[in-house]
């Protein structure tokens, strides 16, 4: 059980307050994090309160200020990037939002030799993506979905691709589903170790179908929006990778590099490319039909000028209970042979752990094991390995970070986070500078977070980064929620849930239950982790009792519950939520005629087939942006977890498990729904077809769009949004206002 | 020493079936890739399948589609050739050949086995 | 499917002379380029791999060259035991189906 921090003295309680939806909306209680900008094994930057950017000197202890504000707020620089041989910064200024990862933005460079702005060759603007080489100050940068190098900042460029065209190829940057759905990045492109070689993908989408909605702007009329983007079954883009030499980049030009005949013989993804050395490269390729993965390590022949693609350096991944990996496939961390890598997968028991493979998968050791999964390798050194997991205490919803060392034999194991701050932290993720020398441990909770610097060798801690005194103090007399985070055995299944409870909980009264979720494949709602947010207001003000509950296709519990939703998206996770709320009505002190059920994206999806279950269980409900259909959204995602959407594969199961054959459901249950109008993950097509289906049925129901407003409703919307849904609810279970 | 040993072949009726088998010795079969290559009388080589090393991926030329089936057996360190709806076309002597390692090219082959397909 | 195309189909030399074998590929096919030597009755056997590389045990008078699109087997002194049909395999990528080319006979003049 998690207490949030106690209010022991009951004199206090008079001079303390429940939080306010105001307090949410403004962010009054928001943390900060500290991650350090590595720019060695002992130095990293980071950018000061009053936005200088500064480099601190680990061992030295000393500071100094690099890059000063004044000169950052010369050109209205948001972001900084300081090339490895130190000698110039690019400052980002004019950010503008594309997509969930990608921006395009106005790029300066600064020369720091001399204190002056790099003039003649300026960088056209604006640019998709610029980056430096790891080594010197080249660089590469996506110009109108094109490539372009320098080799230093002043020089003119030279164009690597020709062929880049919006919404048809793009060189270097992904389309929206690579973006979205594999890559997870604003970039597809990547130097080599020494800069040598620059490697990127070419997405061709020209035979992709379209889709199209109005943005409404100020204007007479609406523009249209387009996107190439693959719903399921649909034709997908043609993804080739390339690679070209930097010294000598008209030499020879990009060189392809090819794909494993086992994956070219249908249709594929390109999933990740890892630099082993600066003559070796790692690609990992996927069929459509995610189930099988091959990682393809390539070497560069000097005498042909060309990679060459072993196929004994083709290494085979695959699933035979569900998709291959977890939500991506992993990725490979090399050891210091170059050839001999660390990986995340599945062991004999359906656990994810981490393996050493040195020459083919079926001869991997496994060096993690044990009913709980390892989640990321963070660094593989000469004789150490850091990974987190959530073995300890056998808490899922629980990260530590642990050191394995591989120098000796038999390795030993230790767990580095486990013991520091036990009850403030049991969350945690790392930040590594070069070889390990130091690392930074930031704590997401339960507690307040906070972010530390330790030594690499002794795991000692050095300093705090950043602990959140000021949050500390203005909680002190805010009376927040109990947490506690607990499982319920139910036919072999085990339901791992986190309840929030107002703060004078009393078990002998009755309380009305929200149920927040999202259940998508491979995620993981409960979690150890400090947060102030809408449900915590829901709570400490208007005495909800609000729970979240993880069933079966949520991850890190290994494969059972992970691939049971495999090809049946829509049933069991449905039914898991059921089975908990019926669970939690048995405790006694919910009030089982004022539950209510909400969710956003696939929780929206999840909640309005609850609402739609005809158990009578649920009052009211809300689903913000959620999918109605499997056939509306992206293949990729899709198709990962539902096969395709033909006679001959899974189109039943995709007819089944829609929103809208279930609109005579809601008939007795209040439903609001919600979507942004410019929605470009899920498009308002899913909220309109559950509008229609529900019209159709004659079935009433409420509903609020957002103009102009895409997947994540933000700004003044956000406001709007979490007021409207504070009403809904406060009517739904007759709060007073 | 390498060696493959091809057996099966015989005088078939056009629409009959077949299996070839190829025997192998002097390599640690089931770490190789492996294929069919076939010359009608008089003719030059036609690749026909190919199968991985793990038995997991098959691969057939356009003219073998659907019609032949290419397996292997690591315990028995034996390829097989399954050939089903034979036609006169398919009249050949069918040699077993192992893959290099790295690259598919065939480093060693087999002597070859005749099939007659007539009516 | 990439198709190889050899030339000439005959050849015919005396012991002692110098062959050059042609084997141009209907699309690049990089290095990936193999040829073979198949005698009368007898199965192929590897003379050349990665388009210049000597398999192992096969004599110096061997010799390939190329890449892309044109390649070439020279046989520098031609012996008796040379006499043969000689074959090119494309293997490009590794990808199926892997092609042949219709063949070289080099006969004795």
């Known amino acids: 059980i998690v207490l949030r921090p106690s209010r022991v003295h009951n004199s206090e309680e008079n001079t303390m307050r429940a939080l306010t939806l105001k307090d949410i909306l403004n962010g009054t209680f928001s943390y900060k994090t500290f991650f350090p900008n590595w720019i060695s094994g002992q130095e990293y930057l980071h950018q000061s309160a009053d936005n200088n950017i500064v480099l601190y000197n680990i061992e030295t202890g000393q500071s100094y200020t690099i890059l000063s504000n004044r000169t950052m707020k010369s050109v209205n620089a948001s972001n900084y990037g300081l090339s490895p041989d130190r000698q110039f910064v690019y400052l980002e200024s004019d950010y503008s939002k594309l997509w969930r990862y990608s921006y395009t933005a106005t790029y300066y460079i600064y020369d720091l030799s001399n204190g002056e702005f790099v003039r003649g060759n300026e960088l056209p603007r604006p640019i998709q993506y610029l980056c430096w080489s790891p080594v010197g100050s080249k660089l590469a940068y996506v110009y109108q979905n094109n490539i372009y190098l320098k080799q230093r900042p002043g020089d003119p460029p030279f164009q690597i691709t020709f062929n880049g065209r919006e919404n048809k190829i793009f060189n270097g940057i992904p389309d929206w589903v690579y973006e979205e759905e594999m890559l997870a990045t604003k970039y597809a492109l990547w130097w080599s170790p020494n800069g040598k070689f620059l490697a990127y993908a070419e997405f061709n989408d020209t035979d992709i179908p379209v889709i199209a909605y109005s943005y409404y702007g100020d204007e007479q009329y609406p523009r249209t929006i387009n996107i190439p983007y693959p719903k399921a079954g649909a034709k997908n883009p043609v993804v080739r990778i390339f690679i070209i030499d930097t010294t000598y980049p008209a030499y020879v030009g990009p060189q392809e590099v090819p794909v494993p005949a086992m994956i070219a013989s249908s249709d594929y993804y390109f999933s990740w490319l890892t630099w082993v050395t600066d003559e070796r490269v790692c690609l990992q390729w996927l069929k459509r039909v995610q189930n099988v993965s091959v990682l393809s390590i390539c070497d560069f022949r000097e005498d042909w000028q060309t990679w060459d693609c072993p196929k004994t350096q083709e290494h085979i991944e695959e699933s035979r209970t569900g998709w291959a990996g977890g939500f991506f496939v992993s990725t490979p961390v090399f050891s210091y042979d170059a050839i001999s890598y660390y990986k995340i997968f599945s062991d004999k028991d359906g656990y994810k752990h981490i393996h050493y493979i040195k020459d083919t998968v079926e001869n991997a050791i496994q060096i993690t094991s044990g009913k709980w999964e390892a989640i990321n390798i963070f660094r593989v050194t000469q004789d150490s390995l850091f990974y987190s997991s959530n073995e300890f205490e056998e808490y899922p919803g629980r990260r530590n970070i642990y050191r394995i060392s591989i120098g000796s034999y038999p390795p030993s194991k230790k767990c580095v986070t486990c013991h520091l701050r036990k009850e403030r932290c049991q969350y945690y993720t790392a930040s590594f500078s070069d070889y390990a020398k130091y690392y930074a441990l930031v704590c997401y909770g339960p507690g307040i977070p906070i972010s530390t610097l330790h030594d690499g060798r002794t795991d000692q801690e050095i300093k705090i980064l950043e602990e959140n005194k000021e949050l500390e103090n203005a909680l002190k007399n805010i009376q927040l929620p109990k947490e506690e985070i607990k499982k319920l055995e139910v036919d072999e299944i085990t339901l791992w849930y986190k309840m929030i409870l107002p703060p004078q909980f009393d078990r002998s009264k009755k309380y009305p239950l929200l149920i927040q979720v999202y259940g998508g494949p491979c995620s993981q709602s409960v979690r150890s982790v400090f947060a102030v947010n809408w449900i915590s207001y829901l709570a400490s003000k208007e005495g909800m009792v609000i729970a979240l509950v993880d069933g079966r296709g949520t991850a890190f519990q290994g494969d059972k519950l992970l691939y049971a939703v495999y090809r049946k998206l829509g049933v069991y996770e449905v039914e898991d939520q059921i089975t908990a709320v019926r669970k939690f009505i048995e405790m006694g002190f919910i009030d089982e005629k004022r539950i209510a059920i909400w969710g956003w994206s696939y929780g929206g999806y999840v909640s309005s087939l609850a609402l739609a279950s005809g158990t009578g269980l649920f009052k009211c409900g809300i689903a913000v942006a959620p999918v109605s259909s499997w056939e509306y959204y992206a293949s990729v995602y899709t198709e990962r977890f539902m096969g395709l959407p033909t006679k001959d594969d899974n189109l039943e199961h995709y007819k089944n498990s829609t929103v809208m054959a279930r609109a005579e459901y809601f008939r007795n249950v209040d439903y609001l729904l919600i979507h942004g109008t410019a929605d470009d993950n899920v498009h308002f097509q899913n909220s309109a077809q559950i509008a229609k289906a529900l019209v159709n049925a004659q079935v009433d129901f409420q509903a609020m769009w957002y103009s102009d407003q895409n997947h994540g409703l933000s700004g003044l919307s956000t406001n709007h949004l979490y007021t409207h849904m504070t009403h809904f609810l406060k009517q739904c279970f007759s709060l007073s206002d | 020493d390498v060696q493959l040993v091809e057996s099966g072949g015989g005088v078939v009726r056009p629409g009959e079936s077949l299996t070839l088998s190829c025997a192998a010795s002097?390599?640690?079969?089931?770490?190789?890739?492996m294929g069919w290559v076939r010359q009608a009388p008089g003719e030059g080589l036609e690749w026909v399948s190919g199968i991985r090393g793990s038995g997991g991926s098959t691969y057939y030329a356009d003219s073998v589609k659907g019609r032949f089936t290419i397996s292997r057996d690591s315990s028995k360190n034996t390829l097989y050739l399954q050939m089903n709806s034979l036609r006169a076309e398919d009249t050949a002597v069918y040699y077993c050949?192992?893959?290099?390692?790295?690259?598919?090219?065939?480093?060693?082959w087999g002597l070859g086995t005749l099939v007659t397909v007539s009516s | 499917e990439i198709v190889l195309t050899q030339s000439p189909g005959t050849l015919s030399l005396s012991p002692g002379e110098r062959a050059t074998l042609s084997c141009r590929a209907s699309?690049?096919?990089?290095?990936?380029l193999a040829w073979y030597q198949q005698k009368p009755g007898q199965a192929p056997r590897l003379l050349i791999y990665?388009?210049?590389n000597r398999a192992s045990g096969i004599s110096d008078r061997f010799s390939g060259s190329g890449s892309g699109t044109e390649f070439t087997l020279t046989i520098s002194r031609l012996e008796p035991e040379d006499f043969a049909v000689y074959y090119c395999?494309?293997?490009?990528?590794?990808?199926?189906?892997?092609?042949f080319g219709g063949g070289t006979k080099v006969e004795i003049k």
């Open positions: 050949a192992k893959e290099n390692n790295r690259h598919s090219f065939f480093e060693y």
């Open positions: 002097g390599f640690t079969f089931s770490s190789y890739d």
């Open positions: 990665d388009a210049s």
């Open positions: 699309q690049s096919v990089g290095y990936y």
């Open positions: 395999q494309q293997y490009y990528n590794n990808w199926p189906p892997l092609t």
